[in-house]
Amino acid sequence: QPDAINAPVTCCYNFTNRKISVQRLASYRRITSSKCPKEAVIFKTIVAKEICADPKQKWVQDSMDHLDKQTQTPKT
C-alpha cells in the first residue's frame, strides 16, 4: 500500500517540435495524472527512446490511431 501511494509520477514538461515517423514508433502511453502540468503522450520508439508529444496535435492523434490498429482484433 505505501509503495502505491508514493509511486513516482512521470510528467512531460516540454513536447517534441518534430513530427516522428510512425515507422519509428513502437508504443505509447498517456499521461493523465492531475499531478502533471500538461496532458501528454509519451511515445516509445523502436530503439526504446521515450519522447513527449502534445495530444492536441493531429500527427500525434494519427500516430496513436496507427499504434492502436496494430493491437486490434483481426477482422473477419
Epitope: R30, T32, E39, P55, Q61, D65, D68, T71
Partner: nanobody, 123 residues
Framework: EVQLVESGGGLVQAGGSLRLPCAAS????????MGWFRQAPEKEREFVAV????????FYSSSVKGRFTISRDNAKNTVYLQMNSLKPEDTAVYYC????????????????WGQGTQVTVSS
Amino acid sequence: EVQLVESGGGLVQAGGSLRLPCAASGRTFSSYRMGWFRQAPEKEREFVAVISRSGGDTFYSSSVKGRFTISRDNAKNTVYLQMNSLKPEDTAVYYCAAGAQMGWAEASTYDYWGQGTQVTVSS
C-alpha cells in the same frame, strides 16, 4: 479528467431503433479513442464498438455487426451509437468510454467511463 454523459436510452420494441449520443467534456476529445460497452443483468460487461480518433476506423463485436454503427463528431465532442434491428438480447446498460492507453477493444485500455444509459428491448 474527461467527463462522459450518455443519453438516448429507453424502451423500444424488437426491430426498432435507438440512437445513443455520448457528450464529452474536459480534455481534448479528438485525442481519445472512443468505445461503447454494455452490461446486461447478471452478465459481464462486453465490448460493443470502437472508433478511432480520426473516425476513419471502426470495429464491432460480432453480435452487433451490421446492425449498430458508431460515429463521432469531433467538433461537437460527441460519439454516437446508432442501433438498428434491436433484439431483446440487446437489453443492457450501455456505457461510453474514452480510450487513453494503447489498445483497441480491451476495456482495460479505457480510462474514462460514463454512468451508462439503460436500453430495454421488448419482444
